[in-house]
């Protein structure tokens, strides 16, 4: 029939599977007078034949790997053998079958990897080829690790990229590989065609021997450095070493100290540059960083710890120029008069700060010397020989030597002899009645004045009055301040009053002296007073359980995801309605009843993290009082920004004609989060044909070099497209353009005739 298998002479394309014996004709061409016969030319390979009557067929199985396309021509001839139609192109496309197995380029591979290398960073590639069509599963290769020897605790230390054959460490491998325990490993790698998905796939295996080398980029042991060193500085205290020569070392002071007394040289030796003072700072923590020649970190920083060792370079110091104590006339022998507490800035709990106390002089020596003693290590003064009499000697002065193991300091103590404390404080009123206050009365307010009197010697510890609340205020909402001149007590609010928990409080005060009462005298009912505090209700705003609520989510969470929640309670027990304020980006909504917060739009860490909004809790009913808290949403990074050029590269030029191939360096960046090591971009040209003229080579994770492959460029501008892949999860690729002008130069700059177009480049390469 006309159509599928027969028809007039015209350009046609046929697809035939390789490896199949001929089973039917390809096509029957019909002749139009005066044409009577047909002839076949081109890449027939003695396989394709056309009979004179126009029957096109093939006589044996095709092989795509020998020839994937046969370009034939068919012509129609008249009775005299003259071409009257055509020749027209007939294309035979040979379709692939899986008739070739993949083979590794090497039967054995060898490589090395440094311990603690970054997981996922390839250190070796295995490579296999398959003659079948890579555009079909027949030629799509799938790499796998068959076995790892040795295998410790069933943990894989190595992984392979199924598509590229790149071998790298797993996270466990990065953490656990140790050449001291196992210096070498063997992997058996398989490769399958059919993308590894078919039972009928072909395969091959190879062996990979891996040597684990030591990572010498390790934090040194903590260093101890004695303070106030008199040796010439700088002094080497420790060292770090990168695994390869050529690293550039630096120190990072995370504490941002006003003076940072350490340095590092280009060998990695770390020095202290000036004497240290333990009393100023007793320990330092800083970081050593190794960078490549472009200033990119080669690995994570190392933490350096320096402890400053104490020497005894501080004498004891007295608590004040004169320390004053009081002692009653009739106090018994051994009674404590007070404790002298001297200080020493040297290290606590060491011999350098351990103090001894000794009385070196007493004046006057009346009625005798040695009336007082001091506990050698505690500094507590005691009455040593007899009771004192005020009318004989109202005041004693002691000189006390305080010493550590190297220094001595003299401290002065004044001891005042006071009247015996044989009178108790007596309240002028035993009941101060009722006091009604609103629960929102200000903190610091004086709400009541109380007064007791004491008949002992004025302005001594025997007559001074201290007021204590001994009952009715377990929460410590109230306090009493005493006027030292009048012994008046002022009752003040120290913490907010609360109607909901304490509407009525029955308060009891006690008035006491700082000095002990003489033997036989006791405080009685006269030293106690009471009053009743009545607190009235005020409608209070709801109270949030936290000042700041914080939540953490990935920036790519689906719209409608719950990202956090807040809680508040109303003191009066009313229901609460929640709302948001300051959601400037329109990213969030809050459930008015539960306080749960949901995303309502795509989040973006690069727009700013944490994202801060206010949450408002409002009473439902009542006076609709509200209170505000903060909600901070920390957005965790995902790889959602393609790489781009780090700066504007307009104005790049080469002087024309090129005398030799030239190159220029460019830098890429992206807006995603990169930890210490920074990004790891890969670079390639943006189209196949650009490879005729240019090549791009990686310098490090962020920089690459664009080089000309020849010198035969026209005098014009070229826009070179470069693909930059960030290798992230998922990997993102950006295509960037570098405009490069080839121009005539005068003194190394582009020459511009008058009236030439603007936008002329200015940076020569």
């Amino acid at each position: 029939q006309e159509g599928k298998f027969s028809g007039p002479l015209k350009p046609m394309t046929f697809s035939i599977y390789e490896g199949q014996e001929p089973s039917q004709i390809i096509f029957q061409f019909k002749a139009n007078p005066p044409a009577v016969t047909f002839e076949l030319t081109g890449e027939t390979d003695n396989i394709f034949v056309i009979e004179r009557e126009g029957l096109l067929y093939y006589n044996r199985a095709l092989d795509r790997e020998t020839r994937s396309t046969h370009n034939l021509q068919v012509a129609a001839l008249d009775a005299n053998g003259i071409i009257v139609e055509g020749p027209v192109p007939i294309t035979i496309k040979v379709k692939d079958i899986n008739d070739n197995r993949p083979t590794f380029l090497q039967s054995k591979y060898e490589g090395s990897v440094r311990q603690n290398s970054r997981p996922g960073k390839p250190f070796l590639y295995v490579n296999a080829t398959d003659l079948d069509d890579p555009a079909t599963p027949n030629g799509q290769l799938y790499y796998q690790i068959v076995i790892q020897l040795p295998m410790i605790n069933n943990v894989m230390y190595f992984q392979i990229n199924n598509k590229t054959g790149a071998i790298s460490l797993t996270r466990e491998g990065s953490q656990e590989l140790n050449p001291a325990k196992n210096p070498s490993y063997n992997l058996v790698i398989s490769v399958k065609d059919m993308g590894g998905q078919s039972e009928n796939s072909f395969s091959d295996t190879t062996s990979v021997d891996i040597i684990v080398t030591e990572n010498i980029w390790k934090a040194p042991k903590p260093v101890e450095m004695v303070e106030n060193s008199t040796d010439p500085h700088p002094i080497k205290i420790t060292q770090v070493r990168w695994n390869d020569p050529g690293a550039q070392y630096s120190l990072v002071d995370k504490e941002k100290l006003p003076r940072f007394p350490f340095s590092i040289d280009q060998e990695g030796d770390i020095y202290v540059t000036q004497p240290l003072d333990r009393e100023e700072k007793d320990a330092y923590v800083f970081y050593a960083v190794a960078k490549d020649e472009y200033g990119k970190p080669l690995s994570y920083p190392l933490e350096i710890h320096v402890k400053v060792k104490d020497i005894n370079d501080n004498p004891p110091t007295c608590p004040s120029p004169v320390t004053v104590f009081e002692v009653q006339e009739n106090e018994r022998l051994g009674n404590s008069i007070g404790t002298l507490t001297a200080h020493d800035r040297d290290e606590e709990n060491t011999a350098n700060s351990f103090l001894n106390y000794r009385i070196v002089e007493q004046t006057p020596k009346l009625p005798m010397d040695g009336l007082f003693l001091i506990q050698t290590y505690a500094g507590m003064l005691q009455l040593a020989k007899q009771s004192l009499k005020k009318q004989d000697t109202p005041q004693y002065n002691l000189t006390i030597e305080v010493s550590d193991k190297d220094f001595k300091t003299l401290c002065f103590v004044q001891i005042n002899v006071i009247d015996i404390n044989d009178q108790i404080p007596i309240f002028e009123k035993s009941d101060y009645g009722n006091l009604t206050l609103a629960e929102d009365t200000n903190i610091g307010s004086t709400i009541l004045t109380i007064q007791a009197t004491d008949a002992d010697e004025p302005f001594t510890g025997s007559s001074k009055i201290l007021y204590h609340i001994i009952k009715g205020d377990s929460e410590g909402r109230l306090g009493v301040d005493t006027d030292p001149h009048t012994n008046t007590g002022y009752v003040i609010i120290k913490k907010p009053l609360d109607f909901e928990t304490a509407a009525v409080s029955n308060i009891v005060f006690k008035a006491e002296n700082p000095e002990p009462l003489v033997f036989g005298v006791k405080y009685n009912a006269s030293s106690f007073a009471k009053f009743t505090l009545i607190v009235t209700d005020v409608n209070e705003a709801p109270q949030f359980s936290q000042h700041v609520f914080q939540a953490k989510v990935s920036e790519d969470v689906a719209i409608g995801t719950k990202v956090g929640n807040v809680t508040a309670k109303d003191p009066e027990g009313l229901d609460i309605s929640y709302s948001l304020r300051g959601d400037t980006r329109g990213w969030l909504k809050i459930d008015h009843v539960t306080g749960e917060i949901f995303s309502v739009a795509p989040l973006d860490r690069e727009a700013g993290s944490p994202y801060r909004v206010q949450v408002v809790a409002t009473e439902v009913g009542g006076s609709s009082l509200s209170s505000v808290s903060e909600f901070h949403l920390i957005l965790m990074d995902v790889n959602d920004n393609p790489p781009r050029l780090a700066k504007d590269y307009t104005g790049l030029f080469f002087c024309h004609p090129l005398s030799a191939p030239g190159s220029l360096i460019f830098e890429a960046t992206d807006d995603d989060q990169h930890l210490f090591r920074g990004p790891h971009f890969t670079f390639s040209l943006g189209s196949g044909s650009l490879q005729n003229d240019w090549e791009v080579s990686k310098i490090n994770g962020t920089h690459a070099r664009l080089s000309t492959r020849h010198t035969e460029f026209e005098e014009r501008e070229y826009v070179v497209l470069i693909r930059i892949n960030d290798g992230g999860r998922p990997p993102l690729e950006g295509i960037v353009s570098l405009p490069v002008t080839f121009c005539s130069c005068v003194e190394g700059s582009c020459f511009r005739p008058a009236g030439h177009q603007t936008g002329i480049p200015t940076v020569g390469m």
Partner: nanobody, 126 residues
Framework: EVQLVESGGGLVQAGGSLRLSCAAS????????VGWFRQTPGKERDFVAA????????RYADSVKGRFTISRDNAKNTLYLQMNSLKPEDTAVYYC???????????????????WGQGTQVTVSS
């Protein structure tokens, strides 16, 4: 394969405006450089404007600078050419084009564009 179809041409008075559209089908408009060229009878195709897809930088022939604007809408897979202050000498068939593997760096050369539309006629009368 990318198929490009232009639309929006027509007859317009000098000083008027037109907006040409170029819809891409077959696969997304993902080629790195897309552009507009124009051709008058008996002459070669001339570069009008190009847009580098990442970063969105644009380039124009001197004769149209300040009057024509090239843009794209990725969501609609469409390239546009907004033509203002049209002159009689802008009369031509306008073609939309996209680079492919032939691109060698000269974004104003027709030979370096692999995919072409069938063209749309723009006539500016005086």
């Amino acid at each position: 394969e990318v198929q490009l179809v232009e639309s929006g041409g027509g007859l317009v008075q000098a000083g008027g405006s037109l907006r040409l559209s170029c819809a891409a089908s077959g696969r997304t408009f993902s080629e790195p450089i897309v552009g507009w060229f124009r051709q008058t009878p008996g002459k070669e195709r001339d570069f009008v404007a190009a847009l580098i897809s990442t970063g969105g930088s644009t380039r124009y022939a001197d004769s149209v600078k300040g009057r024509f604007t090239i843009s794209r809408d990725n969501a609609k897979n469409t390239l546009y050419l907004q033509m203002n202050s049209l002159k009689p000498e802008d009369t031509a068939v306008y073609y939309c084009a996209a680079t492919g593997d032939s691109y060698r760096g000269a974004d104003d050369r027709p030979a370096e564009y692999d995919y072409w539309g069938q063209g749309t006629q723009v006539t500016v009368s005086s």
